[in-house]
Interface confidence: medium
């Protein structure tokens, strides 16, 4: 009996509001096995695959996509999936990344608390999303 | 510049396992995924399977069972576990272009081929 | 199973001409569609990927488009060098024989 596979969660970091020009990188989750993290992004249909997946810890292994500098494009809805053979996991929750203007003052935190979506229940379309131009050093700039 | 040839190839009975092998140069197996394309005479491209930079291997259905990919730091070999007379074509080896994500396993670079005849 | 379609096998057309080859595949993937020109004797040479991008050293009369399940490679400017087979090849999911060829079309140059 195959086993059921738990869902991903996502995370960003430094947090889900980004200045613009700053960096971001999502997170994502899963159980021990994973061989595969996609990171989708839902208003465009698009997403990356990445077998460049890391124990974070005994019972999680994690993948990490980073895009370098944000642009307004960058704003959106992001989730996660895993491929565990021989079978994929349901999407995560959504996670919302905001990109604001920089506006450098002393009162203005340049971005929220690390934020992610665990999960949580909500539907999921199982739609396969479309590949982008990847690059070297897991950059998910294209996912705009 | 990077290269890719393969080698192997040669006459052998049906049944009889055969392997070929891929010698790179010019670039570090480390950063690119690789595949095993082969074409029968007179016939078209028919993709075998693909090896990424973890190792991880992907096969056509068809392939499956029949073929086994597996590497080395400098060679990626295809196994031909029991081969028949259908199996008889040129075999390729094809380098992808990048490393860890699907959207870059199209191939940029191909070897010249090696010819696999199987035959009582 | 993913597959990709391609017809017609062979098409005729003048030097100077243009050609227009069609590939369709069994489901959506997602503009992940490369074009690979092959002579005879020669292995594949990568044209196009991500359904439109050309590839180095290309020429620009090689043109790719498409999205979904459609995709159409359009050459212009017929050379007699062109004379070839032109296969698409998807690369959508490794998981489902992601990376499946067409059948191919040869160009012929009358």
């Known amino acids: 009996q195959e086993e059921d596979l738990p869902r991903p969660s996502i995370s960003a970091e430094p947090g889900t509001v980004i200045p613009l020009g700053s960096h971001v990188t999502f997170v994502c989750r899963g159980p021990v096995g994973v061989q595969t993290f996609r990171l989708e992004r839902d208003s465009r249909s698009t997403y990356n695959d990445t077998e460049d997946v890391s124990q974070a810890s005994p019972s999680e292994s994690e993948a990490r996509f980073r895009i370098d500098s944000v642009r307004e494009g960058n704003a959106g809805l992001y989730r996660c999936i895993y491929y565990k053979p021989p079978k994929w996991s349901e999407q995560s929750d959504y996670l919302e990344l905001l990109v604001k203007e920089s506006s450098g003052g002393p009162d203005s935190p340049d971005t929220e608390p690390g934020s992610s979506a665990g999960p949580t229940q909500r539907p999921s379309d199982n739609s396969h999303n479309e590949h982008a131009p990847a690059s070297q050093g897991l950059k998910a700039e294209h996912l705009y | 510049s990077s290269s890719v040839e393969e080698s192997g190839g040669r006459l052998v009975t049906p049944g009889t396992p055969l392997t070929l092998t891929c010698t790179v140069s010019g670039f570090s197996l480390s950063s690119y995924v690789m595949g095993w394309v082969r074409q029968a005479p007179g016939k078209g491209l028919e993709w075998i399977g693909t090896?990424?930079?973890?190792?991880n291997t992907y096969y056509a259905s068809w392939a499956k069972g029949r073929f086994t990919i597996s590497k080395t730091s400098t060679t990626v070999d295809l196994k031909i576990t029991s081969p028949i007379t259908e199996d008889t074509a040129t075999y390729f080896c094809a380098r992808g272009a990048g490393n860890v994500y699907y959207s870059d396993y199209y191939f940029s670079l191909w070897g010249p081929g090696t010819l696999v005849t199987i035959s009582s | 199973e993913l597959v990709m379609t391609q017809p017609p096998a062979s098409v005729s057309a003048a030097v100077g001409g243009t050609v227009t080859i069609n590939c369709q595949a069994s489901?959506?993937?997602?503009?992940?569609l490369a074009w690979y020109q092959q002579r005879p004797g020669q292995p594949p040479k990568l044209l196009i990927y991500?359904?439109?991008t050309l590839a180095s050293g290309v020429p620009s009369r090689f043109k790719g488009s498409g999205s979904g399940t459609d995709y159409t490679l359009t050459i212009t400017d017929l050379e007699c060098a062109d004379a070839a087979t032109y296969y698409c090849q998807t690369y959508y999911n490794m998981m489902d024989d992601g990376a499946a060829f067409g059948g191919g079309t040869e160009v012929e140059i009358k």
């Open positions: 991500k359904a439109s």
């Open positions: 489901q959506n993937i997602y503009s992940n």
């Open positions: 090896i990424s930079i973890r190792s």
